[in-house]
Interface confidence: low
């Protein structure tokens, strides 16, 4: 007897983090034998949607014309072939930005920092939130969470970095969110460029060297050191 049908591949275009109101297309790719594709959304009635395959039948398109909070969440897809339903795909987490007003991102004491010194990135929201995320552009693992404990809400989160090296240089943004749906994020903060000025022992890399490469330093998770600030927030790295 043949084994279970291979699981399909699920992805979103232009990406899985979508601004409110923008369109997004979810793709599910199975096999040429697929007769039907089904998309399930966590905590929604199943199936969330069904689609006939597009020629040559190995994938289906699920269109979201205008992103709203109802579409944010975790999805899985399946396909049906003449021998039955496939295994579920790996989950796709569709995140909506623009759910809350944008926070402010600043650097203390300054966005210009000498290599080896310390800097703290401060993300501040106008209304109390319980999750803050720091994003570094072009990083393979860009998310750094600070989440409040016991549901306590905060107006800000601190992301301390020490000691700073050239790897920390770059453009950052932050988001804020409420814990009851981590698929809903604020508008992004305005970008903050952190400039690391080198010493003789640690010259500042040229722009060409700071661009992310497949195995470059940007591919490592950003893990600022230092104690968690006294804000009731707990650090999570993803």
């Amino acid at each position: 007897q043949a084994g279970p049908l291979p699981k399909p591949t699920l992805w979103a275009e232009p990406g899985s983090v979508i601004s409110w109101g923008n369109s997004v297309t979810i793709w599910c790719q199975g096999t040429l034998e697929a007769r039907e594709y089904r998309l399930d959304k966590e905590e929604s009635p199943a199936p969330w949607d069904r689609q006939n395959p597009l020629e040559p039948k190995n994938k289906a398109r699920f269109s979201i014309p205008s992103m709203t909070e109802d579409y944010a969440g975790r999805y899985r897809c399946y396909y049906r072939s003449p021998v039955g339903w496939s295994q579920p795909s790996d989950p796709l987490e569709l995140v909506m930005t623009g759910a809350y007003s944008k926070p402010t991102l600043s650097a203390l004491p300054s966005p210009l920092v000498t290599s080896g010194k310390s800097v703290t990135l401060l993300c501040q929201s106008r209304s109390p939130m319980d999750t803050f995320l720091l994003i570094k552009e072009r990083a393979a693992h860009p998310l750094l969470h600070l989440r409040s404990e016991h549901g306590a809400q905060q107006h800000q989160a601190e992301f301390p970095m020490s000691p700073v090296t050239s790897v920390h240089g770059g453009t950052y943004r932050c988001f804020s969110s409420h814990g009851f749906s981590h698929y809903l994020l604020s508008h992004p903060s305005d970008p903050l460029e952190l400039i690391v000025s080198g010493s003789l022992e640690d010259p500042r890399p040229s722009p060409t060297r700071s661009v992310s490469t497949a195995a470059g330093p940007e591919d490592q998770p950003l893990m600022p050191t230092g104690s968690v600030p006294h804000s009731g927030l707990r650090r999570h790295w993803e």
Epitope: E43, H178, S181
Partner: antibody, heavy 123, light 107 residues
Framework: QVQLQESGPGLVNPSKTLSLTCTVS????????WSWIRQPPGKGLEWIGY???????NYNPSLKSRVTISVDTSKNHFSLKLSSVTAADTAVYYC?????????????????WGQGTTVTVSS | DIQMTQSPSSLSASVGDRVTITCRAS??????LAWYQQKPGKVPKLLIS???TLQSGVPSRFSGSGSGTDFTLTISSLQPEDVATYYC?????????FGQGTKLEIK
């Protein structure tokens, strides 16, 4: 202070189309979900459907084949059409705003309601 | 579709009593639940969103709790003006189904 006001005929003949309009005053129609809800005499609330300012809609499956909700952002109003009505569609019809995640503080509940308009289906 | 079931359908309590109304979803809805109060002949009023977030201006004797499938609306000390029908509503995804309502009266 955002206010909603329903308008439309109070009497509709069976098999005809019920048409109601909800006018939004004191605020923008942007960035919120706008819903229709109805309540038959002596009964509970039934959600009919919503429209987003982008024009995206979602309807109650039990009414989907008969319902159309549209929005006119230039006039700051949205509308309900319910076709092929019967006596079972007699109800108070409310329009309501679902608080978005835009500083409304309501996190998804319907925080602003119209006063409701009574629609009777009868010949 | 997810069904929302409230209990009890009606109840009578004395002024000052602690009153609890429950709402159960047939599938998990996380915290995507609102509670409304509708006084006789009046428009529904939003009391609580996100299962436990009290709306501005709502008396603190009202509170909400729960997550997933089981939710509770509590009135810590019943007042005469609380006579109304209370509805829960889920909004994690359409349809945004209401519970059938709980009619609250004073003994």
């Amino acid at each position: 202070q955002v206010q909603l006001q329903e308008s439309g005929p109070g009497l509709v003949n069976p098999s005809k189309t019920l048409s109601l309009t909800c006018t939004v005053s004191g605020g923008s129609i942007s960035s919120y979900f706008w819903s229709w809800i109805r309540q038959p005499p002596g009964k509970g609330l039934e959600w009919i459907g919503y429209i987003y300012d982008s024009g995206s809609t979602n309807y109650n499956p039990s009414l989907k084949s008969r319902v159309t909700i549209s929005v006119d952002t230039s006039k700051n109003h949205f509308s309900l059409k319910l076709s092929s009505v019967t006596a079972a569609d007699t109800a108070v019809y409310y329009c309501a705003r679902r608080g978005g995640y835009y500083g409304s503080g309501s996190y998804g509940g319907m925080d602003v309601w119209g006063q409701g308009t009574t629609v009777t289906v009868s010949s | 579709d997810i069904q929302m079931t409230q209990s009890p359908s009606s109840l009578s309590a004395s002024v000052g009593d602690r009153v609890t109304i429950t709402c159960r979803a047939s599938q998990g809805i996380s915290n995507y639940l609102a509670w409304y109060q509708q006084k006789p002949g009046k428009v529904p009023k939003l009391l609580i969103s996100a299962a436990s977030t009290l709306q501005s201006g709502v008396p603190s004797r009202f509170s909400g709790s729960g997550s997933g499938t089981d939710f509770t609306l509590t009135i810590s000390s019943l007042q005469p003006e609380d006579v109304a029908t209370y509805y829960c509503q889920k909004y994690n995804s359409a349809p945004w189904t209401f519970g059938q309502g709980t009619k609250l009266e004073i003994k």
